[in-house]
Interface confidence: low
């Protein structure tokens, strides 16, 4: 049966022993059966979602794979320095200046770390069976609007670590089956909903470390109805407007960390009713509109750490009943009180600027930091008991 512990203490698994919050998830086996160090990983949100997705993906992939796999090359003659196995072409670091020409039945083409500067019109058109295209770490600066025409079977496109500054509306028009689009570390300075025209099946869009200063004040997901994960980490976005995410009904994860956001429209997240993880860490947010999180009924992970937030309303988190992890690191909460966190009945992890704040969330098993960096464990325990 479940052990009942006083507020601020948590059970040692099925032992009838309770330990204070401080001794749980501190890296030491204080219970004697390691129960206080079990289930300490904060594996909510993004990572859990990815795990779930990968599990499904590999299940599907394994059922579709060839009965008897062969290592023979089935894409005809291949360029020097390229490797080939079955219908997969590996031309990584092959000193290529352009997309190679091989048999049209190729299913995987990896062209990483070459010297491809432009993607010309119809450069991949004949590869109608291509499922995965890797173009990371080239010198691509120009992408023709018809570069990806004909790639009807493509499910994964990697364009990271290039020099792309602009993607024309319609460049992805034919990619109706694309599920992953990764454009990390490029020089994109703007996007519009029409940039993503045709991406009916897109699930994951990663635009980390580009030069975006603003998001369109138009429905960004208009042409990406199945989008689950959207990552804008490391851009220069200044504000979040009310229309941007209006069509992102299926969004599960939104990562906006390490931007320059200083303004949040009160309705910025209103339509994100399936959102599981929201990361706004390391921005310039000073004010949180009172109702900013009110529609995020499914949210399990929220990070607003390292923002110059002046004040957190007492009822700021009241609607987040499913929240499991809350990151408030680097935030001075001058008006902190237990009332702020009490409605968060499912909260298992909380992260503060100061150890002393943990006393205001006594029902949360894992609270960091779990020392003040000075006092001994005995002194800390004594002060908790006194309190």
């Amino acid at each position: 049966q479940d052990v009942s512990c006083p507020l601020g203490s948590f059970p040692c698994g099925n032992m009838s022993r309770c330990l204070p919050q401080l001794l749980h998830c501190n890296g030491v086996d204080d219970c004697g059966n390691r129960a206080d160090e079990d289930h300490c990983g904060d594996n909510n949100g993004w990572s859990l979602q990815l795990d779930k997705y990968f599990a499904n993906y590999y299940k599907l992939a394994s059922t579709n794979s060839f009965e008897a796999e062969t290592s023979e090359c089935l894409v005809g003659s291949v360029p020097m320095h390229c490797l080939c196995r079955d219908l997969e072409l590996d031309c990584d670091e092959a000193n290529l200046r352009a997309v190679p020409s091989v048999s049209s039945n190729v299913t995987v083409m990896s062209l990483q770390r070459n010297f491809i500067r432009t993607l010309p019109p119809n450069g991949f058109r004949k590869y109608h069976e291509l499922q995965k295209l890797c173009l990371q770490n080239n010198r691509i600066h120009s992408v023709s609007v018809s570069a990806f025409r004909g790639l009807r079977s493509l499910t994964k496109l990697y364009l990271s670590h290039n020099r792309i500054t602009f993607l024309k509306p319609g460049v992805f028009e034919d990619l109706h089956r694309l599920e992953w689009l990764i454009i990390e570390d490029n020089h994109l300075s703007r996007i519009s909903p029409l940039t993503f025209y045709g991406l009916n099946s897109l699930i994951l869009l990663v635009l980390m470390n580009n030069a975006l200063t603003r998001l369109p004040d138009k429905p960004l997901c208009q042409h990406m109805p199945r989008l689950h994960w959207l990552d804008f980490e490391g851009n220069r976005i200044h504000n979040l407007r009310n229309l941007t995410f209006i069509s992102c009904n299926n969004l599960t994860v939104l990562v906006m960390r390490k931007n320059k956001i200083n303004y949040l429209n009160e309705h910025a997240f209103t339509h994100l009713q399936k959102l599981d993880e929201l990361d706004l860490g390391s921005n310039k947010i000073e004010n949180l509109p009172p109702n900013i999180f009110k529609d995020l009924k499914e949210l399990s992970q929220l990070n607003i750490s390292y923002n110059p937030i002046q004040k957190i309303e007492v009822n700021q988190f009241d609607c987040l009943a499913k929240l499991k992890s809350l990151s408030l690191e680097g935030i001075e909460i001058s008006n902190i009180q237990q009332r702020m966190f009490r409605p968060l009945i499912n909260l298992s992890h909380i992260y503060f600027k100061k150890f002393q704040y943990c006393g205001y969330a006594p029902h949360v098993r894992s609270c960091k930091p779990n020392t003040d960096g000075i006092s001994s464990l005995e002194n800390l325990l004594a002060s908790i008991i006194q309190r």
Epitope: S144, F166, D174, H176, Y197
Partner: antibody, heavy 118, light 112 residues
Framework: QVQLQQSGAELVRPGVSVKLSCKAS????????MNWVKQRPGQGLEWIGM????????VINQKFKDKATLTVDKSSSTAYMQLSSPTSEDSAVYYC???????????WGQGTTLTVSS | DVLMTQTPLSLPVSLGDQASISCRSS???????????LEWYLQKPGQSPNLLIY???NRFSGVPDRFSGSGSGTDFTLKISRVEAEDLGVYYC?????????FGSGTKLEIK
């Protein structure tokens, strides 16, 4: 608001190249294709070609491939069409038109009348 | 090239009447992405053309609901339910599915 302002009427001698301009305002020139359309007096409309200002990619109607050259100057948000060796057949009103990605011309210039005459 | 044939060339109507213009393409104008990029434009005397209908049946913003488009494959129709004086001019169909893009020859809507 979006506007396409075309250059004024031109009278040129046969064989002397002419360059028509279309200045875009109210939107970012580099985001949309710019098209050019010909209309001879009392006749219908004829599509010449289009250019994407972000990288100057052009798509030209083969009928005009030796006649029209499309260019852009991003710094002045202006698209140009140069007509080489004009003849009386080239006398017409020429329109520039913005092509929305839903494949329609949503904004048009007011037109430039070109008269080729000796 | 895709030939767009419009009928009639001239359409005399009385104000308040219904008008119907037909446009036939010489081959299917379904784009490889599944959309049919068939548009209707109206050019009033001395003016640039204006978009009325795109993708066969979608009214462009600000276009009155008396204008409607229909059709598929190679046969398309523009209907004006009650003609008003401001509707007079030349109507062009246009296909933007296959390069080179092509216009119909035009239908002149005039008062009877």
């Amino acid at each position: 608001q979006v506007q396409l302002q075309q250059s004024g009427a031109e009278l040129v001698r046969p064989g002397v190249s002419v360059k028509l301009s279309c200045k875009a305002s109210g939107y970012s020139l580099t985001t949309y294709w710019m098209n050019w359309v010909k209309q001879r007096p009392g006749q219908g409309l004829e599509w010449i070609g289009m250019i994407h200002p972000s990288d100057s990619e052009t798509v030209i109607n083969q009928k005009f491939k030796d006649k029209a050259t499309l260019t852009v100057d991003k710094s002045s948000s202006t698209a140009y069409m140069q007509l080489s060796s004009p003849t009386s057949e080239d006398s017409a009103v020429y329109y520039c038109a913005r092509w929305d990605y839903d494949y329609y011309f949503d904004y048009w210039g007011q037109g430039t009348t070109l008269t080729v005459s000796s | 090239d895709v030939l767009m044939t419009q009928t009639p060339l001239s359409l005399p109507v009385s104000l308040g009447d219904q008008a119907s213009i037909s446009c036939r393409s010489s081959q299917s104008i379904v784009h490889s992405n599944g959309n049919t990029y068939l548009e209707w434009y109206l050019q009033k005397p001395g003016q640039s053309p204006n978009l009325l209908i795109y993708k066969v049946s979608n009214r462009f913003s600000g276009v009155p609901d008396r204008f409607s488009g229909s059709g598929s494959g190679t046969d398309f129709t523009l209907k004006i339910s009650r003609v008003e004086a401001e509707d007079l001019g030349v109507y062009y169909c246009f296909q933007g599915s296959h390069v080179p893009f092509t216009f119909g020859s035009g239908t002149k809507l005039e008062i009877k």
